[in-house]
Interface confidence: low
């Protein structure tokens, strides 16, 4: 066949015209409503996109494809029926009206139509396969999307939970930081106060050092004068001795005076010396001498002063050895010496009286009816019994007694080093209610001092006293 044209008639039927030689054949076929027109050619791969489709679009497109398939199927069935009907009619007409040799042409046309039908069916099968393929793909994509959405939701929940935890942690840490800041402010204030105190101490010590330097210069000058005086006195003494030996040989009735020694101020008092002052004391069976101040007036007299503080002129931050043998000036501030006191108080029973003065003109005392110190091997541990007096109902020297501690011998009960922190040698506990060998603070600088001269049960923890005296006397005096 040479030509095969298609056109539309007025009642919506498709007109197929076939030209063969001098004859032309026209077929009128019905057109399906939803069939794709030739003006919008079908693209076979249009649905095979790799990019994910929106779910609603995919469903719509699937419905359209299903409708097209259904319509095509109906159209094919109608076409077959139409062809069969027309075939019968045309065959009759051909047999009646046409020449016998046109039969071949008719068969050719019919064959052509059948081929077209077969081609259309094959195309529809392709489309159906493509639709199924696309449907499967869409289902897989939907499943993947669903899984991905679940995974994302879980991740979001986990992250939200993590954010909440971090927020809680942040608020906790903020609170902690604020608390620490408060703490640090207080600590800094405390450190500043201590620094101020230390600066005052340093300036005070500087002035003391200057004074001492002046005294040393004066003492050096005085020393040379004294040496000359001593030399002169020695000559005088030698002359006197010569004279005495001469007179003794002439007068044998003059007895040689015995050398008398005293173990304590009680013995000095009993020997008739009833004036306050510095006396030389010697322990029995010993040649070692110590100079001590004897109070011959207070409470009947006979008191051996073992410690005195009155003006801050002597540094009490001393070593173990210095506290052992004693230091200072017996007429002023001094420490008699732990070794002497230990030996003395272990030979007989002694009482201890502690006399205190504050900066307001008040005085108080604590009296212990039995006092002794252990030996050096036991760190000069203090032993006290029977407290009376006006400086507190409770003993400000911790009971039971503690070992003696100094800046170089830490024998206290504190993880700290009380002697280094509070200054001075003392029978520290941890660190305890007293320290009469602490820093000497002048008036108006004597409060809120943790390292001052302290007797807690009289004046409290931060009060530094004006004056202290520790004195001992035999219990049977």
């Amino acid at each position: 066949y040479n030509n095969f044209r298609k056109s539309m008639d007025s009642i919506g039927k498709k007109q197929y015209q076939v030209q063969h030689g001098s004859c032309s054949y026209t077929f009128l076929l019905p057109e399906m409503d939803n069939c794709r027109s030739s003006s919008s050619p079908y693209v076979s791969n249009a649905v095979q996109r790799d990019a994910p489709l929106e779910y609603d679009d995919s469903v719509q497109r699937l419905q359209v494809l299903e409708n097209i398939m259904e319509n095509n199927t109906q159209w094919l069935m109608k076409l077959e029926n139409y062809i069969q009907d027309n075939m019968k009619k045309e065959m009759v007409e051909i047999q009646q009206n046409a020449v016998q040799n046109q039969t071949a042409v008719m068969i050719e046309v019919v064959t052509n139509l059948l081929n077209q039908t077969a081609e259309q069916t094959r195309k529809l099968t392709d489309v159906e396969a493509q639709v199924l393929n696309q449907t499967t793909r869409l289902e897989l994509q939907l499943l993947e999307h669903s899984l991905s959405t679940n995974k994302l939701e879980k991740q979001i929940l986990d992250q939200t939970s993590e954010i909440n935890k971090l927020q809680d942690k942040n608020s906790f840490l903020e609170k902690k930081v604020l608390a620490m800041e408060d703490k640090h402010i207080i600590q800094l204030q405390s450190i500043k106060e201590e620094k101020d105190q230390l600066q005052v101490l340093v300036s005070k010590q500087n002035s003391i050092i200057e004074e001492l330097e002046k005294k040393i210069v004066t003492a050096t000058v005085n020393n040379s004068v004294l040496q000359k005086q001593q030399h002169d006195l020695m000559e005088t003494v030698n002359n006197l001795l010569t004279m005495m030996s001469t007179s003794n040989s002439k007068d044998p009735t003059v007895a040689k005076e015995e050398q008398i020694s005293f173990r304590d101020c009680a013995e000095v008092f009993k020997s008739g010396h009833t004036t306050n002052g510095v006396y030389t004391l010697t322990l029995p069976n010993s040649t070692e001498e110590v100079k001590a101040y004897c109070d011959m007036e207070a409470g009947g007299g006979g008191w051996t002063i073992i410690q005195r503080r009155e003006d801050g002129s002597v540094d009490f931050q001393r070593t173990w050895k210095e506290y052992k043998v004693g230091f200072g000036n017996p007429s002023g501030e001094y420490w008699l010496g732990n070794e002497f006191v230990s030996q003395l108080t272990n030979q007989q029973r002694y009482v201890l009286k502690i006399h205190l003065k504050d900066w307001e003109g008040n005085e108080a005392y604590s009296l212990y009816e039995h006092f002794y110190l252990s030996s050096e091997e036991l760190n000069y541990r203090i032993h006290l019994k029977g407290l009376t007096g006006t400086a507190g109902k409770i003993s400000s020297i911790s009971q039971p007694g503690n070992d003696f501690s100094t800046k170089d011998a830490d024998n206290d009960k504190c993880i700290c080093k009380c002697s280094q922190m509070l200054t001075g040698g003392w029978w520290f506990d941890a660190c305890g209610p007293s320290n009469l060998n602490g820093m000497y603070y002048p008036q108006r600088q004597n409060t809120n001092k943790f390292n001052g001269i302290k007797w807690y049960y009289w004046k409290g923890s931060g009060y530094s006293l004006k004056g202290t005296t520790m004195m001992i006397r035999p219990a049977d005096f």
Partner: nanobody
Framework: EVQLVESGGGLVQPGGSLRLSCAAS????????IGWFRQVPGKEREGVSC????????YYVDSVKGRFTISRDNAKNTVYLQMNSLKPEDTAVYYC???????????????????WGQGTQVTVSS
């Protein structure tokens, strides 16, 4: 504002137990000696127990030794007094106080104590 707040008091039968708490606010307790004191109307205030700041050394008045335990939790800024085997003579208002001047004192007389709580009543009665 510096404050000490006692809690945990109440009515208890002889032989019973109570735990008193002293919570500090406005300052850190770490560097303070802390004391528990009690007072019966018409009598002098008595130091019951104290604890030092630096090393936790404790002091107890003879009448409570072996029965009462003082402890401190610096992290919570709180001091506790665990009272066991309570006796009728333990009935009193219990106060806590801090000593900032003494630093390491464990003395328990109440002299020089800067801050005091408002007190909590402890009554031991059958």
């Amino acid at each position: 504002e510096v404050q000490l707040v006692e809690s945990g008091g109440g009515l208890v039968q002889p032989g019973g137990s109570l735990r008193l708490s002293c919570a500090a606010s406005g300052f850190a307790l770490d560097y303070y000696a802390i004391g528990w004191f009690r007072q019966v109307p018409g009598k002098e205030r008595e130091g019951v127990s104290c604890i030092s700041s630096s090393d936790g050394i404790t002091y107890y008045v003879d009448s409570v030794k072996g029965r009462f335990t003082i402890s401190r939790d610096n992290a919570k800024n709180t001091v506790y007094l665990q009272m066991n085997s309570l006796k009728p003579e333990d009935t009193a208002v219990y106060y806590c106080a801090t000593d900032s001047g003494g630093y390491i004192d464990y003395d328990c007389m109440g002299l020089g104590y800067d801050y005091w709580g408002q007190g909590t009543q402890v009554t031991v009665s059958s």
